[in-house]
């Protein structure tokens, strides 16, 4: 988790002088509770936005937006703590809006936004906005949280972001898998424009089960430049294992930008349909 590399993060708006500060996620008001605290944020919204760094790289960011409730507690609102928690790693990053002037009621509802938390493809986050100061230990909570799922690199806009392109999102192998005679699969895919090797993983499963019954890896050496964007054809031999009929073919490239952690593409061959054979009717009825 990190912030987009903007030199000056701004939270000021007409009628409010405000500055964005790094935060330890442990606001001082936790340690020194105040008697009067503001109410919680209203209408917290998280959306996927995209932003360029100063170097021109494009990153997905969490666009966080919320409004204030129209009550007198805004007189005691000193700022907000924005927290983003990555759920699979428990990593947390916070920033603090520090209000340098008192809020006053005006004809429009106060609205705040922040779009500088860089998020990763295919990750889920919990976004929390805490109004400051935080409540006393038994006080009503004055925060709002929402979960936010970032699409993976298959998503059209995500595909062209720097992290997705670095992991090979622009490569479309267009995998085809064909069942041949004599327990063979013919796998065909389009090579990328890089002299790097690939590995094909064949995993076979019984019908309707997810425990594999056979697994085989096939290595494809780095193509020559004249083979870039050409189709590569590989014939894999299946093993005649009873019921081991569903096959997943997964292709992993080793591009220089993502090394051994590039996006993988897969295709599946289902078990052949079994014809419904009716129960044979006996031509006599046993008497016992």
């Amino acid at each position: 988790l990190r912030l987009l590399d903007h030199r000056a993060l701004v939270c000021s708006q007409p009628g409010l002088n405000c500055t964005v500060k790094n935060s330890t996620c442990l606001d001082d008001s936790w340690i020194h509770p105040r008697n009067l605290t503001p109410s919680s944020p209203k209408d917290l919204q998280i959306q996927l936005h995209f932003a360029h760094t100063q170097q021109g790289d494009l990153f997905p960011v969490a666009h966080i937006e919320w409004t204030l409730q129209t009550d007198a507690s805004i007189l005691y609102l000193e700022g907000a703590e924005l927290s983003v928690l990555q759920l699979n790693t428990n990593e947390r990053l916070c920033v603090r809006f520090e209000f340098l002037s008192k809020l006053r009621h005006h004809h429009r509802r106060w609205r705040f936004t922040f779009s500088h938390f860089v998020v990763d493809p295919d990750q889920e986050y919990e976004v929390t906005v805490h109004h400051l100061p935080k409540p006393i230990p038994d006080g009503d909570p004055n925060h709002q949280s929402k979960n936010f799922l970032v699409p993976d690199c298959e998503h059209a806009r995500m595909k062209v972001t720097t992290p997705c392109m670095s992991s090979g999102s622009l490569w479309d192998p267009n995998i085809t898998v064909e069942t041949l005679e004599a327990h063979q699969l013919r796998v065909s895919f389009t090579l990328w424009n890089e002299s790097t090797h690939y590995q094909i993983l064949l995993t076979s499963f019984p019908h309707m089960e997810n425990h594999s019954c056979f697994e085989h890896m096939h290595h494809i050496p780095a193509p020559r430049p004249e083979e870039f964007h050409q189709r590569s054809n590989v014939t894999l031999t299946l093993r005649n294992l009873k019921g081991c009929c569903r096959h997943q073919v997964q292709i992993q490239p080793f591009f220089s930008s993502c090394l051994n952690d590039c996006l993988r593409h897969s295709a599946t061959v289902s078990c052949p349909e079994m014809p419904d054979t009716p129960e044979p009717i006996p031509d006599y009825m046993p008497l016992w």
Partner: nanobody, 113 residues
């Protein structure tokens, strides 16, 4: 989550032998293909050998006839027996479980001439 731990690397003279081990945690090891890769300084990671779930093996051309990959499913371990070692075999050797794309931390093999 599968964890792979390699061991057995070291310094050996040209023509000598080493046996690398890769211990895997987690169940269903016997149904997994496994592989060895190696990475020399300033080079990309290269395929060395693979063994499928039935114990059938494939080797990179550079090591064919000198290296042998094997597995012991009872011990959840895959081995790489390296004979007739050459200075160009010097690299960090990595164990790989392709399905989950798990990698070990690597073990250094140095072959002196």
């Amino acid at each position: 989550e599968v964890q792979l731990v390699e061991s057995g690397g070291g310094l050996v003279q040209a023509g000598g032998s080493l046996r690398l081990s890769c211990a895997a945690s987690g169940s269903s090891f016997r149904f997994r293909a496994m592989a060895w890769y190696r990475q020399a300084p300033e080079k990309q990671r290269d395929f060395v050998a693979t063994i499928n779930s039935l114990g059938e093996t494939t080797y990179a051309t550079a090591v064919e006839g000198r290296f042998t990959i094997s597995r012991d499913n009872a011990k959840n371990t895959v081995y790489l027996q390296m004979d007739s070692l050459k200075p160009e075999d010097t690299a960090v050797y990595y164990c790989n479980e392709p399905r989950g794309n798990y990698w070990g931390q690597g073990t250094q093999v140095t072959v002196s001439s």
